[in-house]
């Protein structure tokens, strides 16, 4: 059992809206019928997440780019490395929610 | 547009089942009627996440502890620091899914 308490400013700074690593499950549909399995079956990308100081605000990306990553596509009789492109967020902002 | 491709080994290593920082929204219900707002309204904790090499496996915690953190409870007329305890995962494992 952890005795130490995480101080409020640290709790706040870590929780606020910022790019953070999230796990994205991969969809086999993207690959067509030939592929039996993707390895890995999920990937990690940087996406905006966390909370904003005010209920009227939401955490949105203001800088994004595509990241390309190699994925192993298990097929029969052979398997091959494929490439996948996913959106990654590099900058975030707390913006007023759209009415 | 990013030209570089993340190599498969790196994609695989980052995606596998391991403790990772996740955002947990805080519930006001925990606090009773007196509290008007919690700051921050979410916190980050380490939780098991990612994927396992096989569909028959799931990512589960094998080591956990409670982490205590300071949360600001906004009340009227005054506000005060409170403490919250959440479960954090320190070790994870890919285990056969329960039937």
């Amino acid at each position: 059992h952890q005795k130490k308490v995480v101080p409020w400013i640290d709790v706040y700074a870590r929780a606020t809206c910022q790019p953070r690593e999230v796990v994205v499950p991969l969809s086999m549909e993207l690959m067509g019928n030939v592929v039996k399995q993707l390895v890995p079956s999920c990937v990690t990308v940087q996406r905006c997440g966390g909370c904003c100081p005010d209920d009227g605000l939401e955490c949105v990306p203001t800088g994004q780019h595509q990241v390309r990553m190699q994925i192993l596509m298990i097929q029969y009789p052979s398997s091959q490395l494929g490439e996948m492109s996913l959106e990654e967020h590099s900058q975030c902002e707390c913006r007023p929610k759209k009415k | 547009h990013q030209k570089k491709v993340v190599p498969w080994i790196d994609v695989y290593a980052r995606a596998t089942c391991q403790p990772r920082e996740v955002v947990v929204p805080l519930s006001m219900e925990l606090m009773g009627n007196v509290v008007k707002q919690l700051v921050p309204s979410c916190v980050t904790v380490q939780r098991c996440g990612g994927c396992c090499p096989d569909d028959g496996l799931e990512c589960v915690p094998t080591g956990q502890h409670q982490v205590r953190m300071q949360i600001l409870m906004i009340q009227y007329p005054s506000s005060q620091l409170g403490e919250m305890s959440l479960e954090e995962h320190s070790q994870c494992e890919c285990r056969p899914k329960k039937k």
Partner: antibody, heavy 119, light 106 residues
Framework: QVQLQQSGPELVKPGASVRISCKAS????????IHWVKQRPGQGLEWIAW????????NYNEKFKDKATLTADKSSSAAYLQLNSLTSEDSAVYFC????????????WGQGTTLTVSS | DIVMTQSHKFMSTSVGDRVSITCKAS??????VAWYQQKPGQSPKLLIY???TRHTGVPDRFTGSGSGTDFTFTISNVQSEDLADYFC????????FGAGATKLEL
Amino acid sequence: QVQLQQSGPELVKPGASVRISCKASGYTFTTFYIHWVKQRPGQGLEWIAWFYPGNVNTNYNEKFKDKATLTADKSSSAAYLQLNSLTSEDSAVYFCTRSPYYGYVFDFWGQGTTLTVSS
Amino acid sequence: DIVMTQSHKFMSTSVGDRVSITCKASQDVGSAVAWYQQKPGQSPKLLIYWASTRHTGVPDRFTGSGSGTDFTFTISNVQSEDLADYFCQQYSSSLTFGAGATKLEL
């Protein structure tokens, strides 16, 4: 690594205006409030105002309402303090600093900008 | 405005001593008080907030206590690098700093 980088020293004439900048880096600009604080030699610290970049709200110390104007540019994560109708009383070091929402505790400060008002 | 009064403008101490600085609020501020250290030519540095929470990276010889109107900041086992100005701040109603810092000197 959080940084608040302020503009350099200013020497201005009485009656003129000046704009001091504070460039934030190392965190999401719209998640913390930006405050401005005045320090005159041997006179302690005076809070001027805060600015919240997320919804552009401001709150001024009554004493500085007619003296100071706070603005920001979200695209460059920069905050600005404009001081008008300058007198020798405005000669001081001006700090920008940030705080979380609601608990106005200043965890990071700029290096300070020295303003000298003299003819 | 809430006035924060630091009674001592100067406090003399020696390395290894324990020293306490007090701050009195003109009205109840709950626990919304912070303490800062400032060295000549530098920006202030946050030490304590919410009256008793030590900021990350601040040595545990620095402690704060109090609530309502009376607050105390203590340095146990004073080190030579602790010689500086110290001031309190309330953020319960608007924001005000201690009227004049307390200078810690050898």
